[in-house]
Amino acid sequence: AVNGTSQFTCFYNSRANISCVWSQDGALQDTSCQVHAWPDRRRWNQTCELLPVSQASWACNLILGAPDSQKLTTVDIVTLRVLCREGVRWRVMAIQDFKPFENLRLMAPISLQVVHVETHRCNISWEISQASHYFERHLEFEARTLSPGHTWEEAPLLTLKQKQEWICLETLTPDTQYEFQVRVKPLQGEFTTWSPWSQPLAFRTKPAALGKDT
């Protein structure tokens, strides 16, 4: 597949994990491949085995240390190599000079909870997970609410242009079941992308009081 299209994409979670996906047209599903990480100014190096995730796509996580340890900084460059086994030898398939803080994707927000719920509004909070202290407050969030009879894709996006780990949802319908998700993105990094969406939080608005319009 030398003339086929390939893609090697990696993201740093800002703490101790680099997640990589390698895809190549025409590659065999049972091909054995690895990602090797060689930092330019660290004493460690790391390897992970690429495992199939689809027909011609493999993924793995380079675990650099304890989940909340700060293993890389803005000045680090990590040379990432994809190596695949060909007979008895390993062949280098791709190489990337990886700048961790230019290629960020944080973990999904966690610990979503309903702080207060009424008939027409709901206050929800969350926490960010394994996010570097380097960001200080330079984060933004997107949130969406799933209404009955709609899909997540139809849900309008609510943008929070600052590090605000709560939201007050307004104009909700009384006695109605909703679901809520949030994701996070640092402002830093040319190739930085949104985190995965959080696990959905289900909540129900309170019923309207009888004989009263709330």
Epitope: A1, V2, N3, G4, T5, S6, Q7, F8, Q24, D40, I77, T79, R81, M93, A94, I95, Q96, D97, F191
Partner: nanobody
Framework: EVQLVESGGGLVEAGGSLRLSCAAS????????MGWFRQAPGKEREFVAA????????LYADSVKGRFTISRDKSKNTVYLQMSGLKPEDTALYYC????????????????WGQGTQVTVSS
Amino acid sequence: EVQLVESGGGLVEAGGSLRLSCAASGRAFNNFPMGWFRQAPGKEREFVAAITWISGSTLYADSVKGRFTISRDKSKNTVYLQMSGLKPEDTALYYCAAALKTITRGQHDYTYWGQGTQVTVSS
């Protein structure tokens, strides 16, 4: 946009040497990894060698390993291909290419291309 201009091609006897240069310019050029490909008459374009801009990590085609050396001069935004032990089968139009992030052996993984410089090896 990124401009890539190759030079250094020519006619050389078998066993001889040549050094190709590829000068990169343009506001969009941003430490892109670079590669060399070649296309002989009537054949498909094939990978020769590639180098990452920052660490200088290299990839080579098996057919040129040990004979060709790719290098780069960051201060001049230029990539070189030093070719020695040239063979008649190395005769081709040599293209310089730039990738956005990753070097591979696949031509489709490279975004920007030069016009090429001709290398002819006589027996």
